[in-house]
Interface confidence: low
């Protein structure tokens, strides 16, 4: 038999062979072509079975092939690959990156926020410190610098300045926001009520010696005198 392929009847890089039974050529076409001499394009996008593009990619027919226009988040000849948006390490501050379809989500470490966990959370934003406490922002927490007289995580505790019983001689202690006040028992004076009021000044005893007591005095009368004030 003559070589039917001598005239190169097959196109588009097809394989030509001579049929040993009838001497005719046989073209074995590459993918994407059809017809006796492989000159007809196969419209892969119009094939009845299914869209060759996965994940709802748009199929575009080309000469001898097709290509897929992929939706955001997919890649590959058939949109078969979910793009790993975490590959570029977009999350900052040791956040965990979760790959999503067409995007990513950063799971921030406590104390950080933002799409990329790039922002430090300002825990002082809500003004958590009371009683004029000064808020200092820290990572995932805050610290309150309390003014004198206050304590606690948010300066909410009024320090009881009376707890150390500073007032003496039975005085009543009154706690104030920034200190205390001693209300002295009768007969005492001073900031801490530690001073006994001198009831002998001025001297009440007319003819005798005055002895000071607590909120009282005693007159020791000279001979010949008597009475409370030796009068």
């Amino acid at each position: 038999l003559d070589d039917a392929c001598i005239s190169n009847p097959c196109h588009k890089g097809a394989l030509c062979d001579t049929n040993p039974l009838n001497g005719q050529y046989i073209c074995t076409c590459p993918q994407g072509y059809k017809g006796a001499d492989c000159t007809e394009d196969v419209d892969e996008c119009a094939m009845a079975n299914s869209n060759p593009c996965e994940h709802a990619g748009k199929c575009v027919n080309t000469d001898g092939a097709f290509h897929c226009e992929c939706l955001k988040g997919y890649a590959g000849p058939r949109c078969e690959m979910d793009i790993n948006e975490c590959h570029s390490d977009p999350c900052q501050n040791d956040a965990t990156c979760l790959d999503k379809i067409g995007g990513f989500t950063c799971l921030c470490m406590p104390g950080f926020k933002g799409v990329h966990c790039e922002l430090e959370v300002n825990e002082c934003q809500s003004n958590p410190c009371v009683n004029n406490g000064q808020c200092v922002d820290k990572v995932n927490r805050f610290q309150c610098l309390c003014p004198p007289g206050f304590t606690g995580p948010v300066c909410q505790i009024d320090i009881d300045d009376c707890s150390s019983t500073p007032c003496l001689n039975g005085a009543k202690c009154i706690d104030h926001p920034n200190g205390y006040e001693c209300q002295c028992a009768t007969g005492f004076t001073g900031i801490l009520c530690d001073e006994n009021i001198d009831n002998c000044d001025p001297d009440p005893c007319h003819h005798g010696q005055c002895q000071d007591g607590i909120d009282s005095y005693t007159c020791i009368c000279n001979p010949g005198y008597m009475g409370a004030i030796c009068s």
Epitope: D89, D94, T96, L98, T105, L107, C108, M109, P110, N140
Partner: antibody, heavy 115, light 108 residues
Framework: EVQLVESGGGLVQPGGSLRLSCAAS????????MSWVRQAPGKGLEWVSV????????YYADSVKGRFTISRDNSKNTLYLQMNSLRAEDTAVYYC????????WGQGTLVTVSS | DIVLTQSPATLSLSPGERATLSCRAS???????LAWYQQKPGQAPRLLIY???SRATGVPARFSGSGSGTDFTLTISSLEPEDFAVYYC?????????FGQGTKVEIK
Amino acid sequence: EVQLVESGGGLVQPGGSLRLSCAASGFTFSSSGMSWVRQAPGKGLEWVSVIASSGSNTYYADSVKGRFTISRDNSKNTLYLQMNSLRAEDTAVYYCARSIFYTTWGQGTLVTVSS
Amino acid sequence: DIVLTQSPATLSLSPGERATLSCRASQSVRSNYLAWYQQKPGQAPRLLIYGASSRATGVPARFSGSGSGTDFTLTISSLEPEDFAVYYCQQYSNFPITFGQGTKVEIK
């Protein structure tokens, strides 16, 4: 295949120490936060500690703070938990787990603290 | 600390029935950073759901998570024999990371 394998558990007396190891494979260890979670016999899960991918940040449960130390060697793909001053209540199966929520778990290693 | 309370403690159901497990947080879980795990006796836990509603790789579609803020739910639409296990919720919103006490799903 993503895999975590713990080792180092055993019986120890109260006040003693143990060092747990967790060998990781099948994923980029140096890019993942790693955690330790424990489970006392017949009880629920309890988070113990987590370490950032670089090892720069560590966090602990109050129950172990000051006694346990988490660390990692990214060149060896290994996570560690140094446990000191062990107490009876530390008796549990200790799991290492990937990330801050746990996509992958090891098989666990039993730590028994008893005299 | 964010305390997670799971209910019920035990759920007795038959295969094919629907299981609804609840997880309530003592305060709002930031960004719905809540996960669900399944644990069978003698095995390590297995991640089912993260981000309150996203199914982990290889988890059957009968498992679904929902909820936000302080109330979260894990639903198993039709129980298979292999689903009888203990289920835990976990928040990873704030330190300390906390787990619920677990819900045991047992065969009725």
